[in-house]
Amino acid sequence: YDFTNCDFQKIEADYLRTISKDLITYMSGTKSTDFNNTVSCSNRPHCLTEIQSLTFNPTPRCASLAKEMFARKTKATLALWCPGYSETQINATQAMKKARKSKVTTNKCLEQVSQLLGLWRRFIRTLLKKQ
C-alpha cells in the first residue's frame, strides 16, 4: 500500500496524543538501551509502510501485536487519515487478529515494539524536517 496521500500532520497528532503512550506502556520495565534499532525509514510514506508491516504482520517469534491497544489505534488512525488505505488491508488484519489466541509478551515482541518506537520517532523527525 502506498501511504503517499496520508494526512501526516493528523497521524502525528494521534501518535503523540495516544499511540505513543500505549507503546511506552507496553515497553514498561525495559530500558531504551535494551534493544538496538535495526529497522529504519527514509521518508514519511516509507516510515508508515514499515510501521504497518511491523505492527500487523506476524513474525515467527512475535505473533500477537495486532491485538494490542497501540495496534488498534494505529489501524484506526491509518483508516482515518490515509484516504486510500484499503478496506482489504483492514479486513486482512482483522482476520489475522481472530487467528491468534494467546497473548504472550515475549522478549522478541518487546524488541519489535522497541523498533516501532524508533520508526515512529523517525516519522516525526522527517515531518519536522519537511516543515
Epitope: 494526512d7 495516544t18 488512525t77 484516504p83
Partner: antibody
Framework: QEQLVQSGDEVKKPGASVKVSCKSS????????ISWVRQAPGQGLEWMGM????????NYAEKFQGRVTITADPSTTTTSMELSSLRSEDTAVYYC??????????????WGPGTPITVSS | QSAPIQPRSVSGSPGQSVTISCTGT?????????ISWYQQHPGKAPKLMIY???KRPSGVSDRFSGSKSGNTASLTISGLQAEDEADYYC???????????FGGGTQLTIV
C-alpha cells in the same frame, strides 16, 4: 439490541447554544465512530463532524468548524454535539449515526431517531 | 467541495426497475470506492442500503444493488414494491478534510 438514543426536542433563540446527546447501547462504544448529520426541513442530509472514541479524535466539516464541538463520555457511552451561535438556518433534525465496523468510518450503519432543533426569536 | 448531484425525483410502477444516479467528481466518487446509499421514509431516520459501492448490509433485500462508473454512482432497485417509496441519498467519502458528502437526495414515487 444495538441502538442510539437521542435527547429530546429543543427550541432556542438566535445566538444561543444547544447540546444534543446520543447514548449508545448494545455494542462496544470504543470500536466505532459517532458522526452527527443534520437535515433542515424539506432538505437533504449534511454531515457535520465525527468523534472516534478509540483515538479521542474529532473531525469537523469545514462549514461547522469553530461552531460545533463533539465530545464523548465513555463511562456512560454517550456522545454529545454542541452547536453555538445558533441562527434560523440551523433549524433542523440532528441525527447521531454510527460509523461502520472494522474502522470503516465513512458509512453509517446505525442511526439515532433524530432530535428536532428549532431556532426562533 | 459541493454535494454530488442526484435527480430530484424518479418514479416507477410496481415490479419495474429504477436506477438513481449520483454524479460527483474525481475528488469524491471518482477517487474512492467508498460510496453508500441510504433510504429515508418521511419522518424517519435514514437506513443504510448499500456501502462500498455495491455491498449490502445484512437484512437489506437483494433487489437493491449499487455500481459505479467514473465519477457517477448508481443505485438500482428491481421489482419495485410500494414500501420502496422513499427518499434516497448517496454518500461519498471525500478525503480527510471534507470526509463525507451527501447527495441532494432523490424522491422515489411508486405510480
Amino acid at each position: 439490541q444495538e441502538q442510539l438514543v437521542q435527547s429530546g426536542d429543543e427550541v432556542k433563540k438566535p445566538g444561543a447554544s444547544v447540546k444534543v446527546s446520543c447514548k449508545s447501547s448494545g455494542f462496544t462504544f470504543g470500536s466505532y465512530a459517532i458522526s452527527w448529520v443534520r437535515q433542515a426541513p424539506g432538505q437533504g442530509l449534511e454531515w457535520m463532524g465525527m468523534l472516534v472514541p478509540l483515538l479521542g479524535v474529532t473531525n469537523y466539516a469545514e462549514k461547522f468548524q469553530g461552531r460545533v464541538t463533539i465530545t464523548a463520555d465513555p463511562s456512560t457511552t454517550t456522545t454529545s454535539m454542541e452547536l453555538s451561535s445558533l441562527r434560523s438556518e440551523d433549524t433542523a433534525v440532528y441525527y447521531c449515526a454510527r460509523g461502520g465496523s472494522n474502522y470503516l468510518y465513512w458509512y453509517f450503519d446505525l442511526w439515532g431517531p433524530g432530535t428536532p432543533i428549532t431556532v426562533s426569536s | 467541495q459541493s454535494a454530488p448531484i442526484q435527480p430530484r425525483s424518479v418514479s416507477g410502477s410496481p415490479g419495474q426497475s429504477v436506477t438513481i444516479s449520483c454524479t460527483g467528481t474525481s475528488s469524491d466518487i471518482g477517487g474512492y470506492n467508498r460510496i453508500s446509499w441510504y433510504q429515508q421514509h418521511p419522518g424517519k431516520a435514514p437506513k443504510l442500503m448499500i456501502y462500498d459501492v455495491s455491498k449490502r448490509p445484512s437484512g437489506v433485500s437483494d433487489r437493491f444493488s449499487g455500481s459505479k462508473s467514473g465519477n457517477t454512482a448508481s443505485l438500482t432497485i428491481s421489482g419495485l414494491q410500494a414500501e420502496d417509496e422513499a427518499d434516497y441519498y448517496c454518500s461519498s467519502y471525500a478525503g480527510t478534510d471534507t470526509f463525507v458528502l451527501f447527495g441532494g437526495g432523490t424522491q422515489l414515487t411508486i405510480v
